[in-house]
């Protein structure tokens, strides 16, 4: 079915991966489709097979090279095509001239760890993964802390408007279990979006010292 609403969205992780999602209402789940990437100034082409992620959407990752290799630059344009098999031939279903550094979504931050914890505060650090050296320090972060009895959606967002890979959480409750997440976004790119949230880091504040007013 071609008449259903369809959408094709891709993001570049700034190094060697373009992740794409193709959605089409009314398409058959077993339809065989792929994404083809054709850069304007590179010798390589790349293809990935779209695999179902929900009733009407498919996703795949164009792996352009080693994870930390810089495969594209700000001047590259990559023509992307969705191709679906119809009988013996492939049919083009979507096309886009993709500017990688206008469509960025970095990998989630990794290696979260508690640097220091007290009764009311906790210092946490993390690292960014597979982020281009082109950004230098032009990154921002959002963080959130899950308190007991609340959901992630209710957690207030803490914004770090610079490349700062640590945070000191304050006004915490003693002897309490918390979880913490962080995500990253380059300042560059008209259609750039936030990375996925990091894996949550669980930590517990220290108990208040007995007989002391802390």
């Amino acid at each position: 079915a071609v008449n259903g609403t369809s959408q094709f969205t891709c993001f570049y992780n700034s190094r060697a991966n373009i992740s794409c999602v193709w959605s089409q209402d009314g398409a058959l789940q077993d339809t065989s489709c792929q994404v083809h990437a054709w850069p304007d100034r590179r010798r390589w082409n790349q293809t990935c097979e779209l695999l179902p992620v929900s009733q009407a959407s498919w996703a795949c990752n164009l792996i352009l090279g080693a994870p930390d290799s810089q495969k594209l630059t700000t001047v590259d344009i990559v023509t992307l095509r969705v191709l679906c098999r119809e009988g013996v031939r492939w049919r083009v279903m979507a096309i886009q001239d993709f500017k990688p550094f206008e469509n960025l979504r970095l990998m989630a931050p990794i290696s979260l760890q508690v640097v220091h914890v007290e009764t009311h505060r906790c210092n946490i650090s993390w690292e960014i993964s597979q982020a281009s050296h082109y950004f230098e320090r032009h990154l921002e972060f959002e963080a959130r802390t899950l308190s007991p009895g609340h959901t992630w959606e209710e957690a207030p967002l803490l914004t770090l408007k610079q490349k700062q890979e640590w945070i000191c959480l304050e006004t915490l409750t003693p002897d309490t279990q918390y979880e913490f997440q962080v995500r990253v976004k380059p300042l560059q790119g008209e259609f750039t979006t936030w990375s996925p949230w990091s894996q949550p880091l669980a930590f517990r504040t220290k108990p208040a010292a007995l007989g002391k007013d802390t």
Partner: nanobody
């Protein structure tokens, strides 16, 4: 915001040719994927062809592949549809459409945010 005006339609005999033009105004035209759709009397609007903003990528409806060619001239803010070997079943109102900037060109109407008023093409047998 992109404004689109089609021209070049008319009456032609089967086997003949026409070239449709779409004039676009708006600063974002040169980085916008464009498409042509058509609507025959009593039928739904259907996809005809699309082109990426550099012109490197094109796609066509099965019914027009090999007969129609989509092209663009960004310096003039123009998109064209060269229609050869026309058939009576190509009779329709032809619409130019623009996707929102940064969005892919697809085969469904919902992928396009800006539309022209249309130009009539009639193919007689």
């Amino acid at each position: 915001e992109v404004q689109l005006v089609e021209s070049g339609g008319g009456l032609v005999q089967a086997g003949g040719s026409l070239r449709l033009s779409c004039a676009a105004s708006g600063r974002t035209f040169s980085t916008t994927e464009m498409g042509w759709f058509r609507q025959a009397p009593g039928k739904e609007r259907e996809f005809v062809a699309a082109i990426t903003w550099t012109g490197r990528g094109t796609m066509y409806a099965e019914s027009v592949e090999g007969r129609f060619t989509i092209s663009r001239e960004n310096a003039k803010n123009m998109v064209y549809l060269q229609m050869n070997s026309l058939k009576p079943e190509d009779t329709a109102i032809y619409y130019c459409a623009a996707a929102r900037r940064g969005r892919a060109a697809v085969r469904s109407e919902g992928g396009y945010d800006f539309w022209g008023q249309g130009t009539q093409v009639a193919v007689s047998s």
